[in-house]
Amino acid sequence: LIQERRSHQNNPAAHLTGANSSLTGSGGPLLWETQLGLAFLRGLDYHDGALVANKAGYYYIYSKVQLGGVGCPLGLASTITHGLYKRTPRYPEELELLVSQQSPCGRATSNSRVWWDSSFLGGVVHLEVGEEVVVRVLDERLVRLRDGTRSYFGAFMV
Amino acid sequence: LIQERRSHQNNPAAHLTGANSSLTGSGGPLLWETQLGLAFLRGLDYHDGALVANKAGYYYIYSKVQLGGVGCPLGLASTITHGLYKRTPRYPEELELLVSQQSPCGRATSNSRVWWDSSFLGGVVHLEVGEEVVVRVLDERLVRLRDGTRSYFGAFMV
Amino acid sequence: LIQERRSHQNNPAAHLTGANSSLTGSGGPLLWETQLGLAFLRGLDYHDGALVANKAGYYYIYSKVQLGGVGCPLGLASTITHGLYKRTPRYPEELELLVSQQSPCGRATSNSRVWWDSSFLGGVVHLEVGEEVVVRVLDERLVRLRDGTRSYFGAFMV
């Protein structure tokens, strides 16, 4: 029993939460809260928006983003792409892992109507030590942040 | 090998399913089937809609609700909120854990059109012994129950 | 530590990805890539679209499908059903495990408008040795495949 408990305590896991600073507008990935509130890191590291593996293996990675807007203003993409991407030193360009495309603006029948939508991604991927996973949303201007419960990013080893 | 197997058999996990009695209309959380069909409890308890932790640790908790309606009748919220909330003896009010907002009615272009939508939430949270997690949906009148496969609630220790 | 590591390496897990051959049009389940790209099988088998359990226990199973189209052509269902189903030798018919219904076409306000939507399912189910899980989508003509990152199917023992 002691052994079983210890194994759980050591199993890499993390849950990062959205904050006002998540949206940089710089074209980079979303940034995350790692310590306050519901956020934590256990056996994984964090660096500039990325969860970093300290132990090689298969991880269930997940992310949810809360989307919202008023109508569909011109200049905003009618398609929103939410994805989890891997960074690895050998391949400097990010590799797609899990991706969703949605057209939530279409729900609003007039330009003045408020709409909300949510996108959830989750799946098992392999990470080597030092490999990183980030979240991107295009167009990130439609991501609605509040208190860390509506947009988040996490992982655990399976 | 025996030890590995035992560790799996003892790992807290649960999957609860929606039933006709899930929607109380009382303003309380959704209630769930815990034993019949696909529902089970292993190392977690259930009490008045809540999954109750028997062992402290990090849990991946999840819920899906099936939403549906005919048009968007007046009096129904155009925004639906689906959330997982924690109850802990130290705080009298429920704490938001994972929340989604959606505007599914906007999909129906006329008041007579049938629409369906689904909301999925999942993420890792920490639970102490005796802490509870519940599911709430506002407006719960739009939750469509059938056979326990469309609306459900579960957790497992990671 | 050796034991904990071994237990992770042996823990059944799989992630299968969508490919052009996934959609058969035959009324059968979706088929999947099992080896290349992000796809892998560890302690689970694959057979004609199905993940097959080699070890009895509780599994978190999940699937995401990317949906998309242009308007809502006549003859296409306005409701899309995405589900995970169990095949077991004891019962000739597939058993529903986790199911979602969505009406994504309603998002397109004209017949020429492109729309995208995504459906995610995940939950814990019990599988005996030899039992199979498959993914079905009705109407599968609306499933959009690309690169294995947008539509996928996986599982791991919890």
């Epitope: 090689a56 590799l95 | - | 490919a19 052009n20 790209g37 892998f40 690169d147």
Partner: antibody, heavy 117, light 110 residues
């Protein structure tokens, strides 16, 4: 860094078998497949098949089915390719390569197999 | 499934740009963004130059670029140099756990 080192050159008679090894280092061996590719003198690359190191699943090119067997030894992070009933047209450079997603990287240095009576 | 089609040879002078094509079908090249390119010098093992149609591994010169249009992928080498003289092979995912190689193209730097 990630590296694949293959066994040395072999000379075999027609009808014999050859077993080429490929030792991996610098990554988690059991998390990737190993593919085998051969190249006859002056010819292009020919994919022979691969093996998934974590579950030993194999996938062989149709023209080699029944003559080729790919195996792994996870304890030594080594992959093996055995080709039986050798013919003169099996004379080639045999390469192993890590199968990373949908490409081959890195490659072993190659093992020359000469089939001659 | 037959091999992808590449020209047997191409040539160019130092400083010029050349493009090598790789033609398949909608079931392989056209169906996925999973085309890779390999460079092979005489007597050496192949080396990955491009993956996922257009991405370069670390250490590969930015003179090498990849693209795709329909069922045809292309490798372009700009500012041609003497050391670029080699054989080049394309490879594409073709579904159902299958990868296909092209027949290879011999690049001569004049």
């Amino acid at each position: 860094q990630v590296q694949l080192v293959q066994s040395g050159a072999e000379v075999k008679k027609p009808g014999a078998s050859v077993k080429v090894s490929c030792k991996a280092s610098g990554y988690t061996f059991t998390s990737y497949g190993i593919s085998w590719v051969r190249q006859a003198p002056g010819q292009g690359l020919e994919w022979m098949g691969w093996i998934s190191a974590h579950n030993a699943n194999t996938n062989y090119a149709q023209k080699l089915q029944g003559r080729v067997t790919m195996t792994t030894d996870t304890s030594t992070s080594t992959a093996y390719m055995e080709l039986r009933s050798l013919r003169s047209d099996d004379t080639a450079m045999y390469y192993c390569a890590r199968l990373y997603r949908n490409w081959f990287d890195p490659w072993g240095q190659g093992t020359l197999v000469t089939v001659s009576s | 499934q037959s091999a992808l089609t590449q020209p047997a040879s191409v040539s160019g002078s130092p400083g010029q740009s050349i493009t090598i094509s790789c033609t398949g079908t909608s079931s392989d090249v056209g169906g996925y963004n999973y085309v890779s390119w390999y460079q092979q010098h005489p007597g050496k093992a192949p080396k990955l130059m491009i993956y996922d149609v257009s991405k370069r591994p670390s250490g590969v010169s930015n003179r090498f670029s990849g693209s795709k249009s329909g069922n045809t992928a292309s490798l372009t080498i700009s500012g041609l140099q003497a050391e670029d003289e080699a054989d080049y092979y394309c490879c594409s995912y073709a579904g159902s756990s299958t990868l296909l190689f092209g027949g290879g193209t011999k690049l001569t730097v004049l």
